[in-house]
């Protein structure tokens, strides 16, 4: 059996070397001499040498300073063999623990750290963690054992100690309140690691720590108070610009300015903001009117983007606004008047009063009208007072200026401003209906066969309005109904049947027709009827002499 | 504060007239225009005229044979007159200041309305 | 006569919910004078006079909440209230005073869902 006490071998040993370590035996060396000899990492397989063995005494022996950071346990078998080379013993395994000394220091993982934290964060508040490691022992000895500590802190403001290490983690947190990003940005901490639990073996590195906006700082007007002025009836019209300052992080949520009107409940106002600058651009809504309100008195707020992280005054402006007067035109009351009129209206007599305001109120200025437009030229306005007048008949009938029994003229007011100004206003005449036509037939030229002939319809018209319209009475005068008759076409009256009472020779006849409407108002007209050497329904034909009251008389 | 408050007859007998008194306060009826509209039971608005400050009137053509306005500017009155009425001018009737302010800016919608007086035209 | 059309006759609406009713006049509202829309939006809640909400067609009357909107030009009009609440359960008129005579929409009845 082989007797092999526990081997260790301190790492970094002074020489001499070869040193003893322990000596191998086996128990069979009683009965013969045995030779000794060992395999493996560090005797015959690399590194090799590192250990040897007296083949007869079976010390065992270390050859050079051991690395335990390289080699921390070596493995070898034993081997005793008798004189013959006879194994006498089945190999043995021997470890050998290189046991640590405190040869490495900490190492951070990294020279620069970096780490961020919001303004006015509360102690107690992680920032980062910061790590070093350690290449010696950490399970059997101290030599690993790593303590961080805060060696610097730049700037020392608003106190030297803002942050603490946890000794055993590295985790940073904030120990001081006081953060403000727009006082100091960045911190620069010289941190150390250390082991022995900080009594041993340090190394240095630098934590930096960005202290990242929140919105602690309101906008500030700078100035508070503005002018500007702005002419009336014009909207998208820049009126002045707002200045701001922020503190906070430029082109953020937390600097980006909302500017606010406190006192605009019409809706008169707007304000934008330059997202360059961060101004704010005040323009009207809509259009102002001096003649209501010459001045106005803004008080606008600010505030920003995202709400303040803690209670901050709200700033505000006062900004005055004067509205500039100019001159406008004058205005019809209401822009389209309807006026209902009889066209039998008479010539020189006053239809209706048309007038305009002028919203220069306080111009005092004098409005004058005229007719603008008056295509049948049957109006006259007086020019101070926008009486309107008939100058000659009115004629509903009139279709060429008549739509729908309306007539359209346009009036214009210009007043003595500078420059005149010139409104318009439409007048419509809606010219009810008297019996001022009587009916006429349609058509007036009538052709029949000499053979045959087949009867005429001749259409009653009438350019009236019922009731001064069909049914309508026909009647043939002059001696007329000697050779013709007539006869009703349909209930309404509104078209007749002419026809021959005879055969009639080949000429032109006149023919004398009384038309009458509904109101018994009465038209004697003269048919022009030519009878034509054909049969049947007739064509046009040649004129021959008119024959008086259905006569022929001879050319 | 302005009030329009309008008393009328409440019934009104086929064939015969309509007299409505529209009493005003809180504005001038020299400066102010005064319009009529009536609302028939259920149904939409009818324009049926108007009164301006200077006594100018304005009638709804279709109505202007039956209808007349006059008013007593000293005793802040408007007076609604109609004649031949039948059932379908049963109806509320309303008196309405129209804005006017300032020349024109304001123009001529109806801001004040009387709480109106119930017509039925019923034998 | 200009004739004013309301649609729809009837909008049901939850409240909280934004309601929007449309006008059309048979012709132009729009003055050339003064660039006005001679267009009116009034409110009758029931057994009550009209309220006048809105002139010149965006105008809101002095007392009206924000919530009520007019917008429009020439012949197309709305009014939209952004939130409703239950107290806006009326007919809605408009008017328009650019001709006499003067007419009215047939209304728009908004009911709260």
């Known amino acids: 059996d082989w007797v092999i006490p526990p081997i260790s071998c301190p790492e970094n040993e002074k020489g001499p070397f070869p040193k003893n370590l322990v000596q191998i035996k086996s128990n069979k060396d009683k009965e013969g001499k045995v030779f000794y000899s060992i395999t493996g990492q560090g005797a015959d397989t690399p590194p090799v040498g590192v250990f040897i063995i007296e083949r007869e005494t079976g010390w065992l022996k270390v050859t050079e300073p051991l690395d335990r950071e390289r080699i921390a346990t070596y493995t070898l078998f034993s081997h005793a063999v008798s004189s013959n080379g006879n194994a006498v013993e089945d190999p043995m395994e021997i470890l050998i623990t290189v046991t640590d000394q405190n040869d490495n220091k900490p190492e951070f993982t990294q020279e620069v750290f970096k780490g961020s934290v919001m303004e006015g964060a509360l102690p107690g508040t992680s920032v980062m963690e910061v790590t070093a490691t350690d290449a010696d022992d950490d399970v059997n000895t101290y030599n690993a054992a790593i303590a961080y500590t805060i060696l610097s802190q730049d700037p020392e403001l608003p106190d030297k100690n803002m942050f603490t290490i946890n000794r055993n983690t590295g985790v940073i947190s904030v120990v001081t309140t006081g953060l403000d990003r727009e006082s100091f940005p960045t911190y620069t901490l010289v941190v150390q690691a250390a082991d022995l639990q900080g009594e041993g073996l340090s190394t240095t590195a630098t934590a930096v720590i960005t202290v990242t906006d929140t919105n602690d700082n309101p906008p500030i007007f700078n100035p508070t108070t503005y002018k500007g002025q702005v002419p009336e009836n014009e909207a998208n019209v820049v009126i002045t610009t707002l200045k701001v300052t922020d503190a906070d992080a430029p082109n953020t949520p937390a600097w980006e300015a909302v500017y606010t009107i406190l006192n605009d409940d019409g809706g008169q106002f707007v304000v934008t903001t330059n997202p360059v600058n961060n101004d704010g651009i005040l323009k009207t809504a809509k259009g102002l009117d001096f003649e209501a309100k010459q001045q106005y008195i803004l008080h606008v707020a600010v505030t920003n983007v995202v709400p303040f992280e803690v209670s901050l005054t709200t700033s505000t402006a006062t900004v005055t606004v004067d509205v500039l007067d100019v001159n406008e035109a004058p205005i019809f009351v209401p822009p389209e008047k309807r006026v209902e009129v009889s066209e039998d209206f008479g010539v020189g007599q006053e239809i209706t009063s048309y007038t305009a305001q002028e919203p220069d109120t306080f111009m005092e200025q004098k409005i004058t009208y005229r007719i603008w437009r008056d295509t049948a030229n049957w109006l006259e306005i007086n020019p101070d007072t926008g009486a309107i007048s008939t100058r000659a008949e009115l004629d509903r009938e009139d279709f060429e200026h008549v739509k729908n029994s309306t007539y359209t003229a346009l009036i214009i007011a210009t007043d003595n401003g500078s420059p005149v100004a010139t409104g318009t206003g439409t007048l419509l005449l809606i010219l009810s209906d008297v019996n001022d036509n009587a009916p006429i037939p349609e058509p007036r030229t009538i052709f029949f066969c000499e053979r045959n002939p087949k009867p005429q319809v001749i259409n009653i018209i009438d350019a009236d309005l019922p009731p001064n319209t069909s049914p309508f009475t026909a009647e043939l005068t002059h001696g007329a109904s000697a050779n013709w008759t007539i006869q009703y076409n349909d209930p309404t009256q509104e078209s007749i049947i002419l026809k021959p009472k005879m055969a009639l020779e080949v000429g032109d006849y006149k023919i004398n027709l009384k038309l009458m409407d509904n109101q018994n108002k009465d038209q004697v007209t003269t048919l022009e009827v030519s009878v034509c050497d054909c049969e049947g329904a007739a064509g046009v034909c040649r004129k021959a002499q008119p024959v008086e009251a259905g006569l022929q008389i001879p050319a | 504060q302005v009030q329009l408050k309008e008393s009328g007859p409440g019934l009104v007998a086929p064939s015969q007239s309509l007299s409505i008194t529209c009493t005003v306060s809180g504005f001038s009826l020299s400066r102010y225009s005064v319009h009529w509209v009536r609302q028939p039971p259920g149904k939409g608005l009818e324009w049926l005229g108007m009164i301006w400050g200077g006594g100018s009137i304005d009638y709804n053509s279709g109505l202007k044979s039956r209808l007349s306005i006059s008013k007593d500017n000293s005793k802040s009155q408007v007076f609604l007159k109609m004649n031949s009425l039948q059932s379908d001018d049963t109806a509320m009737y309303h008196c309405v200041r129209a804005q006017f302010y300032y020349g024109y800016d304001g123009g001529y919608a109806m801001d004040y309305w009387g709480q109106g007086t119930s017509v039925t035209v019923s034998s | 006569d200009i004739v004013m059309s309301q649609s729809p006759s009837s909008l049901t609406v939850s409240v909280g919910e934004k309601g929007t009713m449309s006008c059309k006049s048979s012709?132009?509202?729009?003055?050339?004078?003064?660039?006005?829309?001679?267009l009116a939006w009034y409110q009758q809640k029931p057994g009550q006079s009209p309220k006048l909400l809105i002139y010149w067609a965006s105008t809101r009357e002095s007392g009206v909440p924000d919530r009520f909107t007019g917008s429009g030009s020439g012949t197309d009009f709305s009014l939209t209230i952004s939130s409703v609440l239950a107290e806006d359960l009326a007919v809605y008129f408009c008017h328009q005073y650019y001709s006499s005579p003067y007419t009215f929409g047939g209304g728009t009845k908004l009911e709260i869902k």
């Open positions: 012709q132009s509202l729009l003055y050339s004078s003064n660039q006005k829309n001679y």
